[in-house]
Interface confidence: low
């Protein structure tokens, strides 16, 4: 049974199998004598001189060598003499070729071939008979070995259990020798008493040589299914785990490779290794420096941790994350980096391991390999980075990683682009340094180009749009980013994403991005020209109808559609229209779409954020006299007056501004009463007369942030849903599909998908924040 050959390349002095010699001629290529293929058969040479066509070689090469090698010429007599010698020794030449062992030692036989590298015709004809002879000899030897072993094993078993350690040592050496031969190896593994004795001796001995031989014997047995079962049944796993503590490298190597074979091919081995404390021992071995040994050890850890939460926690408790990150930082051996990245990938979906990997410098270490020629390594690093990225928003020293991720957006590999976009989305969330860094290395252009190239592949467009949404708000380069999206021809494609076939998570992200883009006055006209406003209104109406339909059916629970609450769409679209309404031409379009009745209706929403954005858009629209009258005509005065008493400062301020603007043409007496009402409502805590009331509201949210919005609020929500179509990732089926990372539709960094049970724990760990002040479209709260 073959094991993973690429991981079995340990520099150990393993004696080659007798069987290997036989298989050499069965499987390897060798010069075709013509017996098998008939390719070179011709009529025999009557002169005995050989057929010139028989030598399957380039004649020009032969002539060249002849000229080079023999400068002297031969006389006719010398040629006749040589011919005579050949004729006399013909029988010996045939015997030498067929039965070399029958020749007398030291006997010289002249060769008919001047070039020693080329076999003679006789030698070539003799090859099949030589092979046949070897096969017969091997068969006899195999039978002899089997009989010998069958007789010796019961006695050797007794000797291994002897009280005299010297006897035990000798017996161990003999058993090891037997285990190197195919036949006797099978005899050993068919004796449960023998295998048990080997296991017992290995774990009880204090002698290095005994330990090496017994471990080596088990290693040899582990290459066969029958051997693996015998080791397993004899309690070999706890013993081998114990040997992982050996100070002797050869014992350690034998133990880890044997355990690796067991983990790969023996049912029940994983649980046995875990119960024997193998994980702790293996993690402790990660400080070794032999890269091939480390590759096998990390592969064992991956097998044990995959799909097993307890194992992940044990690896964490044993200091695994730090050790694994150190390997990623230190070594260049591809197989080791790949196996280590697989372990980190499996651990990266564990909510306990995730912060430990990040704090150990895992993001930076994984980032070092994103330009490696090995695609499997790059892909594993990216998957792991994506899983970790929501826990890494506070990390320093990410410049190199961010630069590489922006570069990778230009990759032709769809999986690479998907992951890079997801990671960038999470890393640009709530981290102004990261936002600025991504902007400075051309991230806006790269993301816009990514969206353009992605078409309707939402697993790419959605995280890319989220990243753009983060980059266009709340940092020093935000205004530049808002302009850059337009300058790199991003506005048409962004608006297009509001339309089918986009799903709600992508629509939600796009609405948020458009809201941020609208903060830049230069984007007002292009967004209008691309038809953003009618589509936003259409989405708003549809989402609002959906929420109303549910309410009328008596549903109090907010419903998720594709992981998005329709209330979020209502809030987002209204918020985007609010910012777009700063432009006079946009206000005309918005009003022309008969939106005022809907905005007034939204003032009655039980959700404060919806109240705020509705009041905000009405505040902008009310700048125009006709709109102010239309707002009043829709009966907005009552709800707006009610909202003056809202606990949310933004809501109250916007409500006051709308009422004030609606009062522009009213009699002075009405204005005075309104002023008193506004003053008593808005300045409950610090009463003062309003100065220049005409200025009211003009500076509200001038930076795109509503009054009362905490610019520095660090809290964010992290939740699960939907997720990447895992079958589309093109992963090795052996890989753990514990992917996660960027969550479609999240405005926040996102956790690994499968560990849903931990979502509440994460929420509980966050500082209490005033949710009223955390508008969903404010990009990265």
């Amino acid at each position: 049974m073959a094991t993973q050959a690429d991981l079995m390349e340990l520099d150990m002095a393993m004696e080659p199998d007798r069987k290997a010699a036989v298989s050499h001629w069965q499987q390897q290529s060798y010069l075709d004598s013509g017996i098998h293929s008939g390719a070179t058969t011709t009529a025999p040479s009557l002169s005995g001189k050989g057929n010139p066509e028989e030598e399957d070689v380039d004649t020009s090469q032969v002539l060249y060598e002849w000229e080079q090698g023999f400068s002297q010429s031969f006389t006719q007599e010398q040629v006749a003499d040589i011919d005579g010698q050949y004729a006399m020794t013909r029988a010996q030449r045939v015997r030498a070729a067929m039965f070399p062992e029958t020749l007398d030692e030291g006997m010289q036989i002249p060769s008919t071939q001047f070039d020693a590298a080329h076999p003679t015709n006789v030698q070539r004809l003799a090859e099949p008979s030589q092979m046949l002879k070897h096969a017969v000899v091997n068969l006899i030897n195999y039978q002899d070995d089997a009989e010998l072993a069958t007789r010796a094993i019961p006695e050797l078993t007794k000797l291994l259990n002897d009280e005299d350690q010297v006897v035990v040592n000798k017996a161990a050496v003999m058993v090891h020798q037997l285990s190197k031969k195919e036949a006797s190896r099978h005899a050993i593994m068919r004796s449960p008493q023998m295998v048990s004795a080997i296991v017992r001796t290995m774990q009880n001995t204090n002698d290095v040589e005994t330990a090496r031989c017994t471990a080596g014997t088990l290693h040899n047995l582990s290459h066969h299914r029958e051997g693996l079962l015998a080791i397993f049944k004899s309690g070999g796993i706890p013993a081998l785990v114990k040997m992982l503590g050996s100070p002797v490298d050869s014992v350690l190597f034998y133990a880890i490779t044997t355990l690796h074979n067991l983990l790969l091919h023996q049912e029940g081995a994983k649980m046995a290794v875990r119960l024997a404390g193998g994980l702790q021992k293996m993690v402790a071995l990660l400080n070794k420096t032999n890269v091939k040994f480390l590759a096998i050890t990390t592969d064992c850890l991956q097998i044990l941790a995959y799909g097993n939460q307890e194992s992940k926690l044990i690896i964490l408790a044993s200091g695994g994350p730090q050790a694994l990150v150190n390997i990623m930082r230190t070594y260049t051996y591809e197989k080791l980096l790949w196996t280590t990245s697989r372990v980190l990938k499996v651990l990266s979906v564990c909510s306990s391991n995730k912060p430990a990997i990040v704090e150990a410098g895992g993001m930076q270490a994984l980032g070092l390999h994103l330009t490696d020629p090995s695609q499997r390594l790059v892909q594993n690093c990216l998957w792991t980075l994506r899983n970790l990225s929501d826990a890494a928003t506070k990390q320093e020293g990410m410049e190199g990683l961010l630069g590489t991720l922006v570069q990778l957006l230009g990759s032709d590999d769809i999986n690479v682009v998907t992951c890079a976009a997801g990671i960038l989305s999470n890393l640009t969330c709530n981290n102004y340094k990261n936002k600025m860094m991504v902007c400075q290395v051309g991230g806006i252009e790269a993301l816009v180009r990514t969206v353009l190239r992605a078409g309707d592949r939402e697993d790419i467009t959605e995280p890319a749009i989220c990243a753009l949404r983060h980059l266009t708000s709340r940092h020093q380069e935000a205004e530049m980013a808002q302009n850059a999206v337009r300058l790199h021809y991003g506005l048409p494609v962004v608006v297009k994403l509001l339309h089918p076939p986009s799903h709600w998570p992508l629509i939600k992200a796009t609405v948020g991005l458009i809201r941020n883009l609208a903060l830049c006055p230069a984007n007002h006209a292009p967004l209008r020209e691309q038809g953003a406003i009618p589509r936003l209104v259409q989405l708003l109406v549809r989402a609002h109808q959906d929420t109303q339909r549910r309410t009328s059916m008596g549903g109090t629970q907010q419903q998720f559609v594709e992981g998005v609450r329709m209330e979020e769409i209502v809030e987002g679209c209204t918020g985007a229209l609010h910012i777009l309404a700063r432009d006079v031409h946009n206000r005309i379009v918005i009003r022309g779409l008969n939106t005022i009745p809907l905005f007034v209706q939204l003032l009655y929403s039980p959700i404060e954020n919806i109240q705020r954005v509705a009041a905000g858009v009405l505040c902008e629209l009310a700048q125009d006299k006709e709109a102010a009258e239309a707002i009043e005509a829709e009966g907005a005065t009552a709800p707006l007056t009610e909202l003056l008493h809202s606990r949310n400062e933004g809501v109250a301020t916007y409500a006051a501004a709308v009422l004030f603007r609606m009062s522009e043409d009213k009699p002075q007496d009405y204005k005075k009463r309104l002023s008193v009402e506004l003053t008593s409502s808005l300045f409950r805590t610090e009463p003062m007369a309003w100065n220049e009331t005409a200025d009211l509201g003009l500076d509200i949210g001038a930076q795109g942030e509503p009054l009362g919005y905490r610019q520095d609020d660090p809290s964010y929500r992290s939740f699960h849903s939907g997720g990447y179509g895992q079958d589309a990732l093109g992963m090795d089926p052996m890989m753990e599909h514990e992917m996660g990372g960027h969550h479609p539709g999240a405005d926040y960094p996102v956790d690994g998908l499968p560990d849903l049970g931990h979502a509440q724990d994460l929420m509980d760990g966050l500082p209490p924040g005033d949710s009223n002040q955390l508008a969903w479209f404010d990009t990265d709260l």
Epitope: K242, G245, L275, G277, Q280, K281, A284, Q309, E310, L313, I314, A317, S318
Partner: nanobody, 118 residues
């Protein structure tokens, strides 16, 4: 419920020795690791030494050769013999028991102040 009670510690001059002890009580799994960690004010808790139920000992590089960890499985106790103490060894030392049960559980002692000063 597992409880860890620490004893030992105190003030010692550089070059001196101290012995810390930790006794575990309660329902203790046989498959476990006992160890010592230390933490200074404003610093991260750092690993010092650990020992498995099969007496496999492990030491941080900074204490290797100076500290010796030992345990008594029958009494469920672990000791840390600290020799050649240095001022940088000053910290609060915590005993830790990691039980490799399903799921694993980690229990901590109450902490013991060790001060190395002349």
């Amino acid at each position: 419920q597992v409880q860890l009670v620490q004893s030992g510690g105190g003030l010692v001059q550089p070059g001196g020795s101290l012995r810390l002890s930790c006794a575990a009580s309660g329902s203790i799994s046989s498959n476990n690791v006992m160890g010592w960690y230390r933490q200074g004010p404003g610093k991260q808790r750092e690993f010092v030494a650990s020992i498995t139920d099969s007496d496999l000992a492990n030491y941080a590089a900074s204490v290797k050769g100076r500290f010796t960890i030992s345990r008594d499985n029958a009494k469920n106790t672990v000791n840390l013999q600290m020799n050649s103490l240095r001022p940088e060894d000053t910290d609060v030392y915590y005993c830790r028991l990691t039980m490799m049960t399903y799921p694993p559980t980690i229990s901590w002692g109450q902490g013991t102040q060790v001060t190395v000063s002349s």
